[in-house]
C-alpha cells in the first residue's frame, strides 16, 4: 500500500484545504523533471530557469553561459542545437505543431566563434525537421518533404531527395500512420555514429486513402484537412530505406538498403534503424500481419558503393501466441564488438527479458529472468548494462534502474535505484552521458519527483538537480487524496489496481466510485507516480473513490495477460473492469448505486463498452475521443491486435466489437459522448457514428463536440471539457454544486 | 579515356620483394578502386587484393596476407604492389585494374600486366 | 570462399555457331537487388577485357551478340553467332564475397 502522507491532524485541520478544480486546470500542482542535454562524458547543457544556456562541467563543477537569452530572445527562439564541435547553435522558432510529434519551425544558425548569426545560404522556412551531424557541424534538413545537406552551416545546400511532395512521397520525415504507430518520431533520418553517412525513408503515400475532415476556423467557408490514412485492412504507405554518403553525396547518390527476401514476400513495414558503426547499420522490418519482426544488420561494401544485408545476418523473432513485441517491437543496443547485441523479448515463460544475441535468435543468452518484465535498456558500455524494471517487490507499476555488470564472470546485478528514496520514489528513469561517466535519475513518484545526478562507476548521488521544493512547500497545506495500490486475484487473473480514497476515507461510509479506463494492449495505468490532477480533485473536493485497474491486454505482467487480447479487442478489458468493480463493492465502502466510468481514446472505447455491457453497474460514464470500430482505427495499430478486416481473417470480431453494435443497452445508463471535430487520430467519424446508432435506436444520451480540437483537446477547450466532466459526474452521483 | 600504364617485367630471386606500379589517368583517381590480380603462366586469373585510392581502405586476399603490401600516391595517380618473400609459385603476370563504377566489383579497364618471373 | 566451376572447360565450334558457356558458383552470388557475377575475354598476351558486369549488362562498346544471364549459383555466357575474334578464353569472377574469386576458364576454339 502506498499511503501519500495526509500530514492532517485534527490541530491543522482547520488550515488544510481541498483541491479545487480551478488548482487542475490552472496547473498550480504540476512538478518539474531535470533531464542534462549531455555533450560529452562530463558535460551538459540546461535550459536555466532565466532561458540562458549553460554549460555545466561536472568534475570542475565550472558552469559558464553559452549562449545569453537575449539572443535567444533575438530570434524568438523556445529551442536550441548545439552542434558537436562547439562552433554553432542552432535556434528554433515559430513552432507550428502538426501532429503528435512532428511541428514545423523556423531555424537561425549562431556562430559561437565569433558571436554572430551566419548569413548567406540561410535555410529556407518552415523547416520540418533539422539535426547536426553526431560529429562536426554537417547540417541534415527535411523541406518541403525533401532532404537537404550542408556540409558547413554557411555552405550552399546539398539536395539529396528530389521526388518529395505533400501528402504523397515523405522524404526523412514519417507520414501520419509511421508517426503515430511507428516510429512515434518526428524524424525518419539516421546519422552514422562518425557523420559519414545518412540513412533515411522515403515513404510513399500515393495509393493510400485520404482522411477528409472539415476545419471551420474564422473564414466564410471551411478548409479541408486531407490526410493520407490508412484504416485496418486498406492499402499502408510503400517504405524504402536510403542511406547517402554525405562526404561525396554526388558520387554515387543515395543507395537502397534492400529489404529481408522473407518480409519483401508480402506487406511489410520497417519499423527501426540503429546505426552500430560508420559501415555498419542495423534494420528492423515487420511482416503487415505484425508477429514476424526480423532484424537485418548491413554492411557498407567499398566495392558495390552500397549495403550488404546478408542472410547470415538476418534474425527473425516470432511471435506465436500475439504479435511480436510489446506496443513496439524492441530495438537492439549493440555492444563494442559491433555484431553482438542486447535485445529484449519474450522467454520461453512468456516474460519479456534481456538477451544476448551473438550468432543467432536461436542461440541466445537470456540475461535476466523472472516472473516480471525488463522494459528499457539505457546504456550498454564495455563492463556494464543499465536498465529498468519491475521486478523490485514483485510490483509490476514500479520502475527500477539496475546494472548488471557484464565484463565480470559471472555477471552480477545490482539494483541502484530501489533503497535511494524508497518511500518516495519507486517510478525511476535515466540518462546517461557519454560512456555512462555520469547519469541522471528522475523519480516520477510516488512521492514529489526529484531528479539528481550520479557518478556512473560507483553510483554515488552527486547533487540533486530538481527537487520541487516550492510544489512541496504548495501542498503542505492541501488535503490529497489517499492512493493505494493493491491486486485482485480472479480466476487465475492477477489484476493490479490503485484506488484514490478522500482524505479523511472511513471505510464504513459509502463513497461514488468512478473508474478511470485507458485499457489498451500493452498499457500500464496502475502506475507508482505522483500526480494531482482530475481525478485527485474528484477525490479530495467532491469525496469520490477512484479506481484505476489493469485487465487482460495490458503490459509488463507477461505474455498471458497481455496477449488475451490478440484479435479480440473489447471483450476482455471490458470483462476486467466489470469483474474489478465488484470486488471493489464487496469491500463494503461503495455505494453501488453511484458507479461511473471515464476514459479517453482506447479507454473511450472501453467505457462505452461498459457501459453497454447490461451489467447494470454502471449508472453512467463518459467517453472522451473514443474509438468505436476498429475499421475506422489505423492499419499499423489495429492489425497488431485484430488481424485484418476481412473474411477469412478477423472481420467477423471487428464486426461484433463496435460500439453501434450495443446502441440499444445504452438505454439504461447516463452516456456523455465527447470529441474533436479536428481529430486526426480517432476521426470524429467514430463519435458520429455513435450518436447516429443511438438516434437510430431512439436512446437518449448527452454530447459534447469541441470545434477544431484535435485528439488532446486542448487549451481553453481543457478547461471547458473538465469542467462539463464534472458538472455530469456531479449530477450523476447527485453531489451539490 | 581512361588508360593504366604498369612497370616493366621483372626478375627477382626467391626471398626478395618486388614493387610493380601502375599509372592511371582519365578519371578521378581517387574516387576509385584499384584491383590487383595475378595470372601464372598457363593458368587462370587470382585476385590478389584492392586499394580504394581516395579512403586508403585495403582488402587482401587471404594466402597473401603478410607478403602483399598496397599503397596509392594520389599526387601522381599512381597505386603499387609490393610482394615479400618471393617463392618461385609468385611467378606471374600481375595485373591493375580499375573497379567499375557501376559495376560493383567488376573490373571495367586493365593495366597491360607486368611479367615477375622469381628465379634463382 | 566462393568457388567458381566453368563448363565446358573447352568448347570447340565454328564460326556463326552459337555458343553457351557456363558458370556455376558454390554458393548464391545474388541478392535481391543483383546477381554479383561478370565475364571477361582474355586472348593471349593480352590483359582481360570485361564483356558483361552483374549477370547480365552489357558492357558499353562490347557487340550486342554477347548476352548474359542467371541468378543465384547458375550463370550463363552466350555468343549469339561466333565472330573469328571471339575465339579467347572466357572467364566468370564473382564479387558477392571477398576473397573475389574467377573460375578456371573455359577455352573457346575453332573447330
Known amino acids: 500500500i502506498v499511503l501519500r502522507p495526509s500530514r492532517v491532524h485534527n490541530s491543522e485541520e482547520n488550515t488544510m484545504r481541498a483541491l479545487t478544480l480551478k488548482d487542475i486546470l490552472n496547473g498550480t500542482f504540476s512538478y518539474k523533471t531535470f533531464f542534462p542535454n549531455w555533450i560529452s562524458g562530463q558535460e551538459y547543457l540546461h535550459q536555466s530557469a532565466d532561458n540562458n544556456i549553460v554549460l555545466y562541467n561536472i568534475e570542475t563543477g565550472q558552469s559558464y553561459t553559452i549562449l545569453s537569452n537575449r539572443t535567444m530572445k533575438s530570434v524568438n527562439a523556445s529551442n536550441y542545437g548545439l552542434s558537436p564541435d562547439r562552433q554553432f547553435v542552432y535556434l528554433e522558432s515559430d513552432y507550428s505543431k502538426l501532429w503528435r510529434y512532428s511541428y514545423t519551425a523556423t531555424y537561425y544558425i549562431y556562430d559561437l566563434s565569433n558571436g554572430e548569426f551566419v548569413r548567406g545560404n540561410e535555410l529556407p522556412r518552415p523547416i520540418q525537421y533539422l539535426c547536426w551531424s553526431p560529429v562536426g557541424s554537417k547540417l541534415a534538413y527535411v523541406y518541403q518533404n525533401n532532404i537537404y545537406l550542408k556540409q558547413r552551416p554557411g555552405d550552399p545546400p546539398f539536395q539529396i531527395t528530389f521526388n518529395g511532395r505533400e501528402n504523397k512521397i515523405f522524404n526523412g520525415i514519417p507520414d501520419w500512420v509511421y508517426e503515430e504507430e511507428m516510429l512515434a518520431t518526428k524524424y525518419a533520418l539516421w546519422w552514422s555514429p562518425n557523420g559519414k553517412f545518412l540513412a533515411y525513408a522515403e515513404f510513399n503515400d500515393t495509393d493510400i486513402p485520404v482522411i477528409a475532415y472539415s476545419y471551420y476556423g474564422d473564414e466564410q467557408y471551411p478548409r479541408t484537412i486531407n490526410i493520407p490514412y490508412p484504416k485496418a485492412g486498406a492499402k499502408n504507405p510503400v517504405v524504402r530505406i536510403f542511406i547517402i554518403d554525405t562526404t561525396y553525396p554526388a558520387y554515387v547518390g543515395p543507395q537502397e538498403v534492400p529489404v529481408p527476401a522473407m518480409i519483401a514476400s508480402s506487406d511489410y513495414y520497417f519499423s527501426w534503424l540503429t546505426w552500430v558503426t560508420d559501415e555498419r547499420v542495423c534494420l528492423q522490418w515487420l511482416k503487415r500481419v505484425q508477429n514476424v519482426s526480423v532484424l537485418s544488420i548491413c554492411d557498407f561494401r567499398e566495392d558495390w558503393q552500397t549495403w550488404d544485408c546478408p542472410k547470415t545476418q538476418e534474425h527473425i523473432e516470432e511471435s506465436r501466441t500475439g504479435w511480436a513485441g510489446g506496443f513496439f517491437v524492441s530495438t537492439p543496443v549493440f555492444s563494442y564488438d559491433a555484431i553482438s547485441y542486447y535485445k529484449i523479448f519474450s522467454d520461453k515463460d512468456g516474460y519479456k527479458h534481456i538477451h544476448y544475441i551473438k550468432d543467432t535468435v536461436e542461440n541466445a543468452i537470456q540475461i535476466t529472468s523472472g516472473k516480471w518484465e525488463a522494459i528499457n535498456i539505457f546504456r550498454v558500455t564495455q563492463d556494464s548494462l543499465f536498465y529498468s524494471s519491475n521486478e523490485f517487490e514483485e510490483y509490476p507499476g514500479r520502475r527500477n534502474i539496475y546494472r548488471i555488470s557484464i565484463g565480470s564472470y559471472p555477471p552480477s546485478k545490482k539494483c541502484v535505484t530501489c533503497h535511494l528514496r524508497k518511500e518516495r520514489c519507486q517510478y525511476y528513469t535515466a540518462s546517461f552521458s557519454d560512456y555512462a561517466k555520469y547519469y541522471a535519475l528522475v523519480c516520477y513518484g510516488p512521492g514529489i519527483p526529484i531528479s539528481t545526478l550520479h557518478d556512473g562507476r560507483t553510483d554515488q548521488e552527486i547533487k540533486i538537480l530538481e527537487e520541487n521544493k516550492e510544489l512541496e512547500n504548495a501542498l503542505k497545506n492541501i488535503q490529497l487524496p489517499k492512493e493505494e495500490i493493491k491486486k485482485l486475484e480472479v480466476d487465475e487473473i492477477t489484476l493490479w489496481y490503485k484506488m484514490i480514497l478522500p482524505p479523511q476515507f472511513d471505510r464504513s461510509k459509502k463513497y461514488p466510485l468512478l473508474i478511470q479506463v485507458y485499457g489498451g494492449p500493452c498499457s500500464q495505468s496502475v502506475r507508482s507516480v505522483f500526480a494531482v490532477n482530475w481525478i485527485s480533485y474528484l477525490a479530495s473536493k467532491e469525496g469520490m473513490v477512484i479506481a484505476l485497474v489493469d485487465g487482460r491486454g495490458t503490459a509488463f505482467q507477461g505474455d498471458k495477460l497481455l496477449y488475451a487480447v490478440y484479435r479480440k479487442l473489447g471483450v476482455y478489458e471490458v470483462e476486467d473492469q466489470i469483474t474489478a468493480v465488484r470486488k471493489f463493492i464487496e469491500m463494503g465502502f461503495i455505494d453501488e448505486k453511484r458507479i461511473a466510468i471515464w476514459g479517453w481514446s482506447y479507454g473511450g472505447y472501453v467505457s462505452s463498452l461498459a457501459l453497454a455491457s447490461g451489467t447494470g453497474l454502471f449508472k453512467c460514464g463518459i467517453a472522451v475521443a473514443p474509438v468505436s470500430s476498429w475499421e475506422y482505427y489505423a492499419s499499423v495499430y489495429t492489425e497488431r491486435f485484430m488481424g485484418l478486416p476481412t473474411k477469412d481473417d478477423n472481420l467477423e470480431h471487428y464486426k461484433n466489437s463496435t460500439v453501434m453494435a450495443r446502441a440499444e443497452y445504452f438505454r439504461n445508463v447516463d452516456y456523455l459522448l465527447i470529441h474533436g471535430t479536428a481529430d486526426d487520430n480517432v476521426h470524429f467519424q467514430n463519435s458520429a457514428q455513435i450518436a447516429k446508432a443511438l438516434v437510430n435506436a431512439q436512446v437518449d444520451f448527452q454530447a459534447m463536440w469541441y470545434s477544431d480540437q484535435n485528439h488532446g483537446l486542448s487549451g481553453l477547450s481543457t478547461n471547458h471539457l473538465y469542467t462539463h466532466m464534472t458538472h455530469f459526474l456531479k449530477q450523476c452521483f447527485s453531489l451539490s454544486d | 579515356q581512361v588508360q593504366l600504364v604498369q612497370s616493366g617485367a621483372e626478375v627477382k630471386k626467391p626471398g626478395a620483394s618486388v614493387k610493380v606500379s601502375c599509372k592511371a589517368s582519365?578519371?578521378?583517381?581517387?574516387?576509385?578502386?584499384i584491383h590487383w590480380v595475378r595470372q601464372a603462366p598457363g593458368q587462370g586469373l587470382e585476385w590478389m587484393g584492392w586499394?580504394?585510392?581516395?579512403?586508403?581502405?585495403?582488402k587482401y586476399a587471404q594466402k597473401l596476407q603478410g607478403r602483399v603490401t598496397m599503397t596509392t600516391d594520389t599526387s601522381t595517380s599512381t597505386a603499387y604492389m609490393e610482394l615479400r618473400s618471393l617463392r618461385s609459385d609468385d611467378t606471374a603476370v600481375y595485373y591493375c585494374a580499375r573497379h567499375g563504377g557501376t559495376g560493383r566489383g567488376a573490373m571495367d579497364y586493365w593495366g597491360q600486366g607486368t611479367l615477375v618471373t622469381v628465379s634463382s | 570462399e566462393i568457388v567458381l566451376t566453368q563448363s565446358p572447360g573447352t568448347l570447340s565450334l565454328s564460326p556463326g555457331e552459337r555458343a553457351t558457356l557456363s558458370c556455376r558458383a558454390s554458393?548464391?552470388?545474388?541478392?535481391?537487388?543483383?546477381?554479383?557475377m561478370h565475364w571477361y575475354q582474355q586472348k593471349p598476351g593480352q590483359a582481360p577485357r570485361l564483356l558483361i558486369y552483374?549477370?547480365?549488362n552489357l558492357e558499353s562498346g562490347i557487340p550486342d551478340r554477347f548476352s548474359g544471364s542467371g541468378s543465384g549459383t547458375d550463370f550463363t555466357l552466350t555468343i549469339s553467332r561466333l565472330e573469328p575474334e571471339d575465339f579467347a578464353v572466357y572467364y566468370c569472377?564473382?564479387?558477392?564475397?571477398?576473397?573475389?574469386?574467377f573460375g578456371q576458364g573455359t577455352k573457346l576454339e575453332i573447330k
Open positions: 586499394i580504394h585510392a581516395g579512403s586508403g581502405s585495403i
Open positions: 552483374l549477370a547480365s
Open positions: 582519365g578519371y578521378t583517381f581517387t574516387e576509385n578502386i
Open positions: 569472377q564473382q564479387s558477392r564475397e571477398l576473397p573475389y574469386t
Open positions: 554458393q548464391s552470388v545474388s541478392t535481391s537487388a543483383y546477381s554479383y
